[in-house]
């Protein structure tokens, strides 16, 4: 069983899923309002968003005193965060600016990918090896969308029987999408294109918030029960509480290299020939050069206009 990394508003914590009755280890303390969290295991980095400080920050696993600011301007409510461990990029959602953005892992070369038809974007999940990203939107027209990580091929994949889609996670081995709905109180799964939808846990969960997966087990935080729960990812059986008495459980991830499988990085050689951003793409050559917001890509498709 994995270590579970979760945001707890005031801090980030790690808890052993097999021994959740033990106290969780505080990874980073003294925080204001930590909401989203993710990591790049191979780089030893943990990222989180703070919705009160309107910032995205990071630390190194073994140097928790060294907190670095990554993105500190132009954020209002960065509710969702995801690390592209292959392309070494950071993606985030902001439910007040109504944007989905991407940058380098250090926050540089920031680009707005989506800014239209977003209402309350929340959870975001990446599949770098296929070049797709997924996000939930719990706004007036709730939905789950998929798009290329380069901003292409945007498509609504779930828009029925959905109300407050909060948690979202991907099963890379089985090519499935899992999500939790806090109003309809369920966990459902589907194929990555939204087809073959099935209930995993039928509507009985008080207020599921964030969702993660490790091997055959789903783990999620619940705002109402102040706990982390788990069940079998196929059947929903074996529902159990593995860690309780959490101050304010927010985002959660299975903290393991297994959740960030290695694959060929199409941007790996010479940044794909891109002068600035090289983003994963679902279509050949499986990457796309891109420029920071406000800077034009030249006709060669590789170089950003001078002054970027």
């Amino acid at each position: 069983a994995p270590l579970l990394l979760y945001a707890n508003r005031r801090d980030l914590r790690l808890v052993d899923a097999t021994n959740g009755k033990e106290n969780a280890t505080i990874v980073v303390g003294g925080l204001e309002d930590a909401a989203a969290v993710d990591f790049v295991f191979s780089h030893g980095l943990i990222y989180w968003s703070d919705v009160s400080e309107e910032a995205i920050k990071r630390t190194e696993f073994n140097k928790t005193e060294s907190v670095q600011n990554v993105v500190v301007s132009g954020l209002l409510s960065p509710d969702g965060l995801a690390c592209d461990w292959l392309g070494e990029k950071l993606y985030w959602t902001d439910s007040e600016t109504n944007r989905i953005e991407v940058s380098n892992l250090d926050g540089s070369l920031r680009k707005v990918l989506f800014w239209q038809e977003l209402d309350q974007p929340r959870a975001i999940a990446l599949d770098p090896s296929s070049g797709f990203m997924y996000w939930t939107d719990w706004g007036e027209v709730p939905k789950i969308e998929r798009a290329g990580m380069d901003g292409s091929s945007r498509f609504i994949i779930i828009n029925s029987e959905i109300y407050w889609p909060n948690g979202l996670t991907l099963d890379y081995e089985e090519q499935k999408l899992y999500w939790a709905d806090a109003k309809l109180n369920f966990i459902h799964k589907s194929n990555l294109d939204g087809t073959n939808r099935q209930a995993v846990v039928k509507g009985s969960l008080p207020h599921p918030f964030a969702l993660t997966l490790f091997e055959d087990i789903l783990y999620w935080t619940d705002w109402s029960t102040h706990s982390i729960l788990a069940c079998n990812k196929y059947t929903g059986e074996g529902l159990r509480e593995i860690h309780s008495d959490i101050f304010s459980p927010m985002d959660i991830h299975a903290f393991s290299q297994q959740r960030q499988p290695n694959a060929t990085n199409p941007c790996g050689i010479d940044n794909g020939g891109c002068s600035h951003l090289c983003l994963m793409s679902p279509v050949k050559p499986f990457y796309q050069c891109a420029c920071p917001t406000g800077v034009k890509l030249l006709e060669n498709g590789k170089t950003c206009k001078d002054g970027a």
Epitope: A199, K202, S204, L205, P206, D222, S224, L239
Partner: antibody, heavy 119, light 107 residues
Framework: QVQLVESGGGLVQPGGSLRLSCAAS????????MHWVRQAPGKGLEWVSV???????YYADSVKGRFTISRDNSKNTLYLQMNSLRAEDTAVYYC?????????????WGQGTLVTVSS | DIELTQPPSVSVAPGQTARISCSGD??????VHWYQQKPGQAPVLVIY???NRPSGIPERFSGSNSGNTATLTISGTQAEDEADYYC??????????FGGGTKLTVL
Amino acid sequence: QVQLVESGGGLVQPGGSLRLSCAASGFTFSVNGMHWVRQAPGKGLEWVSVIDGMGHTYYADSVKGRFTISRDNSKNTLYLQMNSLRAEDTAVYYCARYDYIKYGAFDPWGQGTLVTVSS
Amino acid sequence: DIELTQPPSVSVAPGQTARISCSGDNIGSKYVHWYQQKPGQAPVLVIYGDSNRPSGIPERFSGSNSGNTATLTISGTQAEDEADYYCTRTSTPISGVFGGGTKLTVL
């Protein structure tokens, strides 16, 4: 062990009021949804009200505007304030925990307290 | 709200299998739970989440749920199983639906 004990039932005249209590022990009361269910003499079970772990309250249409559910987490106690009582409110009133680990089953139930509305 | 319909009564000989149905529109999309109530006592949970048995409930109790019908099955029924049985379905946050109840008589 997990236990619920109701009290406060009794005989009351139509139009009168009564407050039922349900003392909980053996579990983390504050995070659990708690329900009131009643059973009129010789009849089936009828759901009355719930207060969830976040404090949201809901009522059956038959009691809306007359009954108020509340909780005191510091005392591990659930309440049902019943006003403007009618003869048809005569029933045994049970409190029950919404067990989210059991997919939302009511478990356990209290032993019940009898409310009789009669002149 | 979905109405849950149960037969008012079911009779079974000792040692035989009793089946109590609970029907409702697309009930299979919700979790169904079953309670046993003996005279003068509070209800006791015997099946939760369609087919799970709480600890202390004999193995002869089982449940299933799909489509428009959930079923409580009591295999090798014993005299002590004579009671009223109620189905309900999880419907957060209200959870306001109980079946009308079935009186199980062991002949």
